[in-house]
Interface confidence: medium
């Protein structure tokens, strides 16, 4: 049998059964999540569940820019350092940078400091680029 690789919407990139869209727009975390959802297909801000997935995403984004952090779908909605993925994925893989998690920082970004391979927490009302993800 011929197994067809699923196709992503135009402009989105495919990796291991998921489609990703990197949006070079400045949005706060909740507006970014709403915009991801608006593209349909069950898209949300991206969950990153393995080092391989993180590396593929980081390589893709580095082709566009290397200086601006990017919102992902990890947040702390209860503000108790109980982080969860907005798409419901299990919070098992972690890639936090060594920075303090304190203050009013309850949303996660891919940090440009380590080529987008590590995460930092940031204030959710900051306006940043964002990464969406869906399963085709």
């Amino acid at each position: 049998d011929i197994i067809m690789r699923p196709s992503c919407a135009p402009g989105w990139f495919y990796h291991k059964s998921n489609c990703y869209g990197y949006f070079r727009k400045l949005r706060n975390w909740s507006d970014a999540e709403l915009e991801c959802q608006s593209y349909g297909n069950g898209a949300h801000l991206a969950s990153i569940l393995s080092l391989k997935e993180a590396s593929t995403i980081a390589e893709y984004i580095s082709g566009y820019q290397r200086s601006q952090p990017i919102w992902i779908g990890l947040h702390d909605p209860q503000k108790r350092q109980q982080w969860q993925w907005i798409d419901g994925a299990m919070y098992l893989y972690r890639s936090w940078s060594g920075k303090s998690m304190g203050g009013n920082k309850h949303c996660a970004e891919m940090s440009s400091n380590n080529n987008f391979l590590t995460w930092s927490s940031n204030e959710c009302n900051k306006r940043q680029h964002f990464l969406c993800k869906y399963r085709p």
């Epitope: 402009g11 869209g21 990197y22 949006f23 070079r24 727009k25 400045l26 200086s67 601006q68 306006r127």
Partner: antibody, heavy 124, light 110 residues
């Protein structure tokens, strides 16, 4: 090649009216927002007005609001600026500029191509 | 009324480096203002140099670069040349379809 050519400038008395035109070529005119920017003699640049690609949304600087009207005719690839109740302080070179706004993937918000300008003089 | 502030004039030696800045009368400039920079020589239309803080427009030499320095947008010219002598304007997008130009910086290459 993108080209923007302004016309319609000239000498007008205070309180008078003038309509500027900007003929665009080399790109799909209706796909781009457009703007007018002016420069008084010996002074800096000042943003005046902008209009969406469809013409449905318009924006104005406070200094011209209620006196100037921006419009476009996409079938003629032409941008307009209707200027009423002109004042001496409206004397300037008026530039037409293509405006990069939002796409699905990216926000821009800058002026990427400029015309050579047309001079408007308001004097009695 | 938001005022965008630039140095009125600046001079640089040929081959030298100069950084022009663009600030706000109240508050800090960040990438969320989408700073852009334009070069204008006397009697000519402006030319787009930098947009989205740090992206060079096509055909602009890489000696021109944009950044955020502290609470201002900045345009740095590395290895200044005689024909860089011009007026330089920054523009900030305030949102809701409103753009504000700075007063411009007259750059002299001595």
């Amino acid at each position: 090649e993108v080209q923007l050519l302004e016309s319609g400038g000239g000498l007008v008395q205070p309180g008078g009216s003038l309509r500027l035109s900007c003929a665009a070529s080399g790109f799909t005119f209706s796909s781009y927002a457009m703007s007018w920017v002016r420069q008084a003699p010996g002074k800096g640049l000042e943003w005046v007005s902008a209009i969406s690609g469809s013409g449905g949304t318009t924006y104005y600087a406070d200094s011209v609001k209620g006196r100037f009207t921006i419009s476009r005719d996409n079938s003629k690839n032409t941008l307009y600026l209707q200027m009423n109740s002109l004042r001496a302080e409206d004397t300037a070179v008026y530039y037409c500029a293509r405006l990069r706004g939002s796409t699905r993937w990216e926000d821009f918000y800058y002026f990427d191509y400029w015309g050579k300008g047309t001079m408007v003089t308001v004097s009695s | 009324q938001t005022v965008v502030i630039q140095e009125p004039s600046f001079s640089v030696s040929p081959g030298g480096t100069v950084t022009l800045t663009c600030g706000l009368s109240s508050g800090s400039v960040s990438t969320t203002y989408y700073p852009s920079w334009y070069q204008q020589t006397p009697g000519q239309a402006p030319r787009t140099l930098i947009y989205n803080t740090n992206t060079r427009s096509s055909g602009v030499p890489d000696r021109f670069s944009g950044s955020i320095l502290g609470n201002k947008a900045a345009l740095t010219i590395t290895g200044a040349q005689a024909d860089d002598e011009s007026d330089y304007y920054c523009v900030l997008y305030l949102g809701s379809g409103i753009w504000v130009f700075g007063g411009g910086t007259k750059l002299t290459v001595l």
